[in-house]
Interface confidence: low
């Protein structure tokens, strides 16, 4: 059976439809209606109950960057809230609170950077205490043709319910006072997002008059954030007229929640930011709008912006890495909830702990660097996704290693050099997050030196030879010795050992061919020889 509009108005727990913001991937969002109680004669406290934010599913294609109207009829969004009675004007009979919202559910999700959460879809209103301790709301949420309703209970402040002395018996019927009739009246604000106006309906009152006009004709096309004071309301069944004040809320499509967490700090911080879109602060008094952000399970992480709406960032720092936080972000209008988002945010992977490397027993040109497998500490550090191992003598070389290795053989080293090895673990979260580098160092063993460079021979006299050379490119050891061997006809003649490469060989035979062999000795190893042939002259004397 298709419900008629009147059926819908009598329903107390209908799902509400609001204009939809751009579809986004599914996100943990929940919104509860605010409760705004409106009292007559300026003592109003209004309790709004906008409902649950829509969680859009990942397969949806994005909408254009504009507010997409609700499919729920007339491109409108209706809120429902009730005002509480003034303490001087109790409503006759009182009222009972509707059932609470059964088990609010949140859908796990994460927040892509700079993503707007659509403020959308009030679901069903619930009891909510406004600022006044005397506040009690009988909140009903109705699904009228245009969507959800924000019902404002608008008590009057003129006159108490009519009573007679106990001893008096009256047979005639007296009219109910309008203060009593309208003191507990429900006002449905219907938001027409197409033209950003509200319609206010006085619920369950037939032929309500606002002044001399039908309220139905007067209380529409209300501008958001406007207030209408001292509206004289009555109908045929009550007297005298009473007054009510209406405080029209801003459209919830004007608010969107964005993730503003810097990637670099996403492991220990959550940043959320309410932004407004097309909210005219000339007409909407920012003093009436404020917000609160609170993330559990932290106790003292709360941002509050009271009595002003500044679309600034609220960043909670010093949080635990890789931890699920439930963040409640609320927009308050006149001190009570207009929009509530409940979002599950997981902080990014923490900085991993780097194990201490051991540089092992080095050879001349390689060594094995090893380290223990990391022990994961869920409180802070995350298991590494990999390692970066760097080694340097003068210049540095680095190697990226997978997380399943615990050793690496460093090769192509230079003999007899001091090396420093640094190892750091990293995780790939929203950014690569590096742990603190741990170091070890080693000294490679000596190896054979290179040949000497630039060996030259010359004949200063007829029977003497000068031999000079430069040092090897790499000495590969601790000491510096130059060794000269002189040979002639394949036979050993003489040998010199000096710390510099400047040899003077004299008293040689005249007119004889000699072979000069120079090698370098580094105190551990001797290198290959460089050979030069030279002949002495005949004796000129």
């Amino acid at each position: 059976q298709t419900p008629t509009p009147s059926d819908e108005l009598s329903t107390t727990e209908n799902a509400l439809l609001l204009p939809q913001s751009d579809p986004l991937p599914a996100r943990t969002t929940e919104s509860t209606p605010p409760s705004i109680s409106e009292r007559g004669n300026g003592s109003s406290e209004t309790t709004y109950h906008p409902g649950v934010l829509s969680t859009l599913l990942p397969h949806l294609s994005p909408q254009p960057d504009s507010q997409t109207p609700s499919a729920g009829g007339a491109d409108t969004q209706t809120f429902s809230s009730q005002a509480d009675n003034p303490t001087l004007t109790p409503a006759p009979g009182g009222g009972t609170d509707p059932p609470g919202v059964p088990g609010e559910r949140t859908v796990p999700g994460t927040i892509p950077a700079d993503t707007a959460f659509p403020v959308d879809t009030p679901s069903l209103a619930r009891n909510s205490s406004a600022a006044s301790p005397t506040h009690t709301s009988n909140v009903s949420t109705t699904d009228i043709s245009s969507g959800a309703s924000l019902t404002t209970l608008t008590p009057s402040t003129l006159g108490l319910a009519s009573t007679d002395p106990p001893s008096t018996t009256i047979a005639t019927t007296t009219k109910q006072t309008c203060a009593a009739m309208f003191g507990n009246i429900t006002v449905n604000y219907t938001y027409e997002s197409s033209n950003q106006t509200f319609k206010a309906d006085l619920k369950d009152v037939q032929n309500a008059k606002c002044g001399n006009e039908d309220c139905e004709n007067v209380l529409n096309n209300l501008e958001e954030c406007s207030q209408i004071k001292n509206i004289s309301v009555s109908n045929d069944s009550c007297a005298p007229a009473t007054t009510i004040d209406l405080y029209v809320p801003p459209g919830t499509d004007k608010f969107s929640l964005h993730d503003c967490t810097p990637k670099e700090k996403a492991n220990t911080s959550i940043c959320l930011e309410w932004k407004t879109k097309n909210l005219d602060f000339r007409k909407c008094n920012s003093d009436n709008i404020s917000y609160v952000l609170h993330c559990e399970p932290e106790n003292n992480t709360k941002c509050i912006r009271r009595n002003t709406f500044i679309p600034e960032r609220c960043q909670l720092d010093n949080l635990r890495a890789q931890t699920n936080y439930t963040c409640v972000a609320e927009i308050l209008y006149r001190g009570v909830k207009l929009v509530k988002n409940v979002i599950n945010v997981q902080t990014d992977l923490g900085i991993p702990e780097t194990p201490k490397p051991s540089c092992g027993d080095p050879a001349a040109r390689k060594t094995l660097v090893s380290w223990p497998e990391p022990v994961s500490k869920p409180e802070s550090a995350s298991k590494p996704h990999g390692y970066v191992l760097c080694y340097k003598n003068n210049s540095e070389k680095c190697k990226s290693l997978p997380n399943n290795v615990t050793s690496f053989e460093v090769e192509s080293l230079k003999p007899y050099k001091y090396y420093e090895v640094s190892l750091l673990a990293y995780v790939n979260g929203k950014i690569q997050r590096n742990g603190t580098a741990e170091k070890c160092n080693f000294h490679t063993k000596a190896d054979r030196p290179d040949k000497v460079n630039g060996m030259k021979t010359s004949r200063p006299t007829d029977n003497s030879i000068n031999v000079t050379c430069g040092p090897p490119y790499e000495t590969n050891g601790p000491k510096t010795f130059y060794i000269l061997v002189v040979r002639s006809g394949g036979s050993f003649v003489t040998k010199y050992n000096k710390t510099n490469c400047q040899f003077y060989v004299d008293n040689l035979y005249y007119s004889t061919d000699y072979e000069f062999l120079v090698s370098f000795h580094n105190g551990v190893y001797e290198g290959d020889s460089v050979i030069r042939n030279e002949s002495t002259n005949f004796n000129a004397k």
Partner: nanobody, 118 residues
Framework: QVQLVQSGGGLVQPGGSLRLSCAAS????????MGWYRQAPGSQRELVAS??????SYADAVKGRFTISRDYAKNIIYLQMNSLKPDDTAVYFC??????????????WGQGTQVTVS
């Protein structure tokens, strides 16, 4: 999951008529609101008509010319478009929205149907 399959659409002369249909499958949807949106080239998607709990509403531009109806038994909505104008040329999308008391809502969209009035 809800799947929406659209049909209808095509090329029609000004003043002519077309009927679009959108069949939802995968789940009963009597609690959902369904509607039609359209998007002309270079424009943003706009609501054309919607129907929820038996109550229909229309964008001003199509009032009196378009009629939205819904077959609850077959999970189908229809958009009867009469007196079509060139301004009605757009891709028409079927929309399905359910709002849940548990705290979130779901939107689903059809694949889109081209309507050209020329």
């Amino acid at each position: 999951q809800v799947q929406l399959v659209q049909s209808g659409g095509g090329l029609v002369q000004p003043g002519g008529s077309l009927r679009l249909s959108c069949a939802a499958s995968g789940r009963a949807f009597n609690s959902a609101a369904m509607g039609w949106y359209r998007q002309a080239p270079g424009s943003q998607r706009e609501l054309v008509a919607s129907i929820s709990a038996g109550t229909a509403s229309y964008a001003d531009a199509v009032k009196g010319r378009f009629t939205i109806s819904r077959d609850y038994a077959k999970n189908i909505i229809y958009l009867q478009m009469n007196s079509l104008k060139p301004d009605d040329t757009a891709v028409y999308f079927c929309n399905y929205r359910t709002t849940y008391t548990s705290g979130y809502s779901e939107d689903y969209w059809g694949q889109g149907t081209q309507v050209t009035v020329s």
